[in-house]
Interface confidence: low
């Protein structure tokens, strides 16, 4: 059977993509349960994930209230079955997380090419404006809504028959590129926030090629 000793959580790690934000930690609890608290630097602590045996806590609802704030979380350890009990100093053991600023640190999710349309020697490539969990006036904002012109997309494109890649950039969600008539091209996009020092780039989108259903070809 378990002892009454609790241990402090460790390896507190923020996992965040497009503002979906989860705090993870170790260890799996043996004789304890956890409660998480989160606050901004100047704010009050708010408790979440009460007396859980999980080693993670979804804090998205808290951080989306202001994604430009810097947040700190802490994980409290309580004896299992006796959550009123405290540590030897009269309060439960806890461990602080690193600071986390969602706007600067959330990972950019893998983008998706929504469509491409060829008109003569021009191709218009549109990137899906992914919805985030950030709300304004009861509606969910898109990635572009949140980041504005801080967010750019890089397009990689190449002839299906060769491996030489070209690139284009846009601070909207659309590209207009020149192509050779009669050639099929493949496309991949990447989201980038150039002003960041960490997590600047997303992973590349799935490759989409002309001649597949997603695109539209019009010979003019």
């Amino acid at each position: 059977s378990g002892t009454t000793n609790t241990v402090a959580a460790y390896n507190l790690t923020w996992k965040s993509t497009n503002f979906k934000t989860i705090l993870e930690w170790e260890p799996k609890p043996v004789n304890q349960v956890y409660t998480v608290q989160i606050s901004t630097k100047s704010g009050d602590w708010k408790s979440k994930c009460f007396y859980t045996t999980d080693t993670e806590c979804d804090l998205t609802d808290e951080i989306v209230k202001d994604v430009k704030q810097t947040y700190l979380a802490r994980v409290f350890s309580y004896p299992a079955g006796n959550v009123e009990s405290t540590g030897s100093a009269g309060e439960p053991l806890y461990e602080n997380s690193p600071e986390f600023t969602p706007y600067l640190e959330t990972n950019l999710g893998q983008p998706t090419i929504q469509s491409f349309e060829q008109v003569g020697t021009k191709v218009n490539v549109t990137v899906e404006d992914e919805r985030t969990l950030v709300r304004r006036n009861n509606t969910f904002l898109s990635l572009r809504d949140v980041f504005g012109k801080d967010l750019i997309y890089t397009l990689y494109y190449w002839k299906s028959s060769s491996s030489g890649k070209k690139t284009a950039k846009t601070n909207t969600n659309e590209f207009l590129i020149d192509v050779d008539k009669g050639e099929n091209y493949c496309f991949s996009v990447q989201a980038v926030i150039p002003s960041r020092t960490v997590n600047r780039k997303s992973t590349d989108s799935p490759v989409e090629c002309m001649g597949q259903e997603k695109g539209e070809f019009r010979e003019i």
């Epitope: 059977s1 378990g2 799996k28 999980d54 299992a80 079955g81």
Partner: antibody, heavy 125, light 108 residues
Framework: QVQLQESGPGLVKPSQTLSLTCTVS?????????WSWIRQHPGKGLEWIGE???????RYNPSLKSRVTISVDTSKDQFSLKLSSVTAADTAVYYC??????????????????WGKGTTVTVSS | EIVLTQSPGTLSLSPGERATLSCRAS???????LAWYQQKPGQAPRLLIY???SRATGIPDRFSGSGSGTDFTLTISRLEPEDFAVYYC?????????FGGGTKVEIK
């Protein structure tokens, strides 16, 4: 009674990505357990690859971390393994398993109490 | 990484005899994370013992586990024909979770 069933191609070419799915039946993948992948090389012991919680959080074996992705689809009660850039050394029987937290007398215990039958994956050109 | 070393590698015994299998950890492991499994050829592992000493559902009482810290033992008090198999210990507390190399219990 919870049962697990692995599925996926039995033959993968070198440098390609191995993809396997584990389907949970007789219970829900969202019921508070962790879900693991383990492999066993021919005639050898067991190697833990990684685990996922129903919310999507993962832990991986550091020796494989750069090549492994484990994901979950709660709507289908499935979790999946992708192992990229495979070589012949990845030839093994791959098992999925449930890692259960069990509360008893003031403490929690962890163990893998339900296993799939295993699926053999051969990496060869 | 916690290395689990099982000994002996092979145990040759007759039905009715007592089998004692050892599992030694390279660093201390909470007993809450220590389990034993049985594996027969062509089959998946089967949970025998969890928490170092608690028998899993449906496991006969001839199987028992003991130990703490770095030394753990699986004992089969009286071997039945169906007990000849490979036995693995495992810790599931510290990433990466690790298994011992296994002990094969074979018929003498």
């Amino acid at each position: 009674q919870v049962q697990l069933q692995e599925s996926g191609p039995g033959l993968v070419k070198p440098s390609q990505t191995l993809s396997l799915t584990c389907t949970v039946s007789g219970g829900s993948i969202s019921s508070g357990q962790y879900w693991s992948w383990i492999r066993q090389h021919p005639g050898k012991g067991l190697e833990w690859i990684g685990e996922i919680y129903y919310s999507g959080s993962t832990r991986y074996n550091p020796s494989l971390k750069s090549r492994v992705t484990i994901s979950v689809d709660t709507s289908k009660d499935q979790f999946s393994l992708k192992l990229s850039s495979v070589t012949a050394a990845d030839t093994a029987v791959y098992y999925c398993a449930r890692d259960t937290p069990y509360y008893y007398d003031g403490g929690y215990y962890y163990y893998m109490d339900v296993w799939g039958k295993g699926t053999t994956v051969t990496v060869s050109s | 990484e916690i290395v689990l070393t099982q000994s002996p590698g092979t145990l040759s015994l007759s039905p009715g005899e007592r089998a004692t299998l050892s599992c030694r950890a390279s660093q201390s492991v909470s007993s809450s994370y220590l389990a034993w499994y049985q594996q027969k050829p062509g089959q998946a592992p089967r949970l025998l013992i969890y928490g170092a000493s608690s028998r899993a559902t449906g496991i006969p009482d001839r199987f028992s586990g003991s130990g703490s810290g770095t030394d753990f033992t699986l004992t089969i008090s009286r071997l039945e024909p169906e007990d000849f198999a490979v036995y693995y210990c495992q810790q599931v507390g510290v990433v990466p979770y690790t298994f011992g190399g296994g002990t094969k219990v074979e018929i003498k």
